[in-house]
Interface confidence: low
């Protein structure tokens, strides 16, 4: 038997993926566990195998369909269960009635690129990935720039309170290497959270012209 507290957290990417993490304080040795998804009003259901991500936590992705297919709506409720093998049976370890559009976490923005770079500024664009058409323009973004000698955690956050898939970074230092990241969040959903940060985009500002002050 498994003792200890259990935490089961899932997010919907707004299209065809539910990602889950299950944490269990207590011994769970070589046990096969799965997440089962049972929508209340749909003909499909899905299962994924939980894989260890740390000593006491497991994760998996429920792939509901092709990446851009709209598999759930704001009125759906999906019963999510953690099932673990105990001998010849499966034991239910955790359960939640999951409201997908109250628990959103989008995919990280993709296709980051430098549109234009100068000595002190850089214009960067990106695209959102696998985001539902239901959001229309109801999205916000956070961005951060990594300067030399600093960490990502020290980088100040820039907030874009609208669906704006570009930013113009100002007051940069000439001839300097920077990295840039962006993340996205729908305005909808009580438990909605930020997407993961995008892959960093590295860029370098242009050097100052010779004989000019910087």
């Amino acid at each position: 038997a498994v003792n200890g507290t259990s935490r089961f957290t899932c997010f919907y990417n707004s299209r065809a993926n539910i990602s889950c993490v299950w944490s269990q304080d207590g011994a769970l040795q070589d046990t096969s566990c799965q997440v089962h998804a049972w929508p209340d009003r749909r003909r499909w259901n899905q299962t994924c195998e939980l894989l260890p991500v740390s000593q006491a936590s497991w994760a998996c992705n429920l792939i509901l369909g092709t990446p851009d297919s709209q598999k759930l709506t704001a009125v759906d409720i999906v019963t999510l269960r953690v099932m673990c093998r105990e001998g010849v049976r499966w034991r239910m370890m955790a359960i939640q009635d999951f409201k997908p559009f109250e628990n959103l976490r989008l995919m990280a923005p993709i296709s980051l690129q430098v549109v234009h770079v100068e000595t002190h500024r850089c214009n960067i664009s990106w695209k959102i990935s696998q985001a539902s058409h239901y959001f229309e323009r109801h999205l916000e973004f956070e961005a951060r720039t990594l300067s030399p000698g600093h960490t990502w955690e020290e980088a100040p956050l820039m907030t874009l309170k609208q669906k704006q898939e570009w930013i113009c970074l100002e007051t940069l230092t000439p001839d300097t290497q920077y990295e840039f990241q962006v993340r996205v969040k729908p305005l909808q959903g009580e438990f909605t959270t930020w997407s993961p940060w995008s892959q960093p985009l590295a860029f370098r500002t242009k050097p100052a012209a010779l004989g000019k002050d910087t």
Partner: antibody, heavy 119, light 106 residues
């Protein structure tokens, strides 16, 4: 509606092999285990094995050396292959599925397919 | 393997009678299932997890028991209940069934 449809039964020579299909509809074999159970004429039920949703299998130890259960997720079909058949393997072969969980027992059964092992 | 022994192997009762079938396991089992099989048909699940009625099953059917001793009851036998009844354990591989109890109408 959940349905299971077996096919592939018939007359098989002793020493020969048998390949049965179980076509599933109304659910996905990637979400449920599918079991095979047989019943010899006038006899009781005998559990042979199962293929789970993830593709792993459990077999009755009495048959493990000559039994293979597999599946094709794209066809939503489970396959049952038994080798070295003998007269006592003559039976109606059923595929079955548990309810939402194993705890629910064999809630869904196919109609069965008769296999006769005889020369 | 866990041996499941049903008794009686057959019985004859009148319509309206209370019918009881027992299933004895050779070792303790956690959960027991009961199936009905009419001639020429696939088995039908009646009782799961010892005492729970499967979907669409009339309430005259019931199950009880624990450990190695389990009981299946038809509170008022009906003509459509003519069938063979099987118990089954789902605690240890291989899953095993009782040999069956054939129920007939007098």
């Amino acid at each position: 509606e959940v349905q299971l449809l077996e096919s592939g039964g018939g007359l098989v020579q002793p020493g020969g092999s048998l390949r049965l299909s179980c076509a599933a509809s109304g659910f996905s074999v990637t979400s449920y285990g599918v079991h095979w159970i047989r019943q010899a004429p006038g006899k009781g039920l005998e559990w042979l094995g199962v293929i789970w949703s993830g593709g792993s299998t459990d077999y009755n130890a009495a048959f493990i050396s000559r039994l293979t259960i597999s599946k094709d997720n794209s066809k939503n079909t489970v396959y049952f292959q038994m080798n070295s058949l003998r007269a006592e393997d003559t039976a109606v072969y059923y595929c079955a599925r548990a309810g939402d969980y194993n705890y629910d027992g064999f809630a869904y059964w196919g109609q069965g397919t008769l296999v006769t092992v005889s020369s | 393997d866990i041996q499941m022994t049903q008794s009686p192997s057959s019985l004859s009762a009148s319509v309206g009678d209370r019918v009881t079938i027992t299933c004895q396991a050779s070792q303790s089992v956690s959960f027991l299932y009961w199936y009905q099989q009419r001639p020429g048909k696939a088995p039908r699940l009646l009782i799961y997890d010892t005492s729970n009625l499967a979907s669409g099953v009339p309430s005259r059917f019931s199950g009880s028991g624990s450990g190695t001793s389990y009981t299946f009851t038809i509170s008022s036998l009906q003509p459509e209940d003519i069938a063979t009844y099987y118990c089954q354990q789902w605690s240890t591989y291989p899953l095993t069934f009782g040999q069956g109890t054939k129920v007939e109408i007098k």
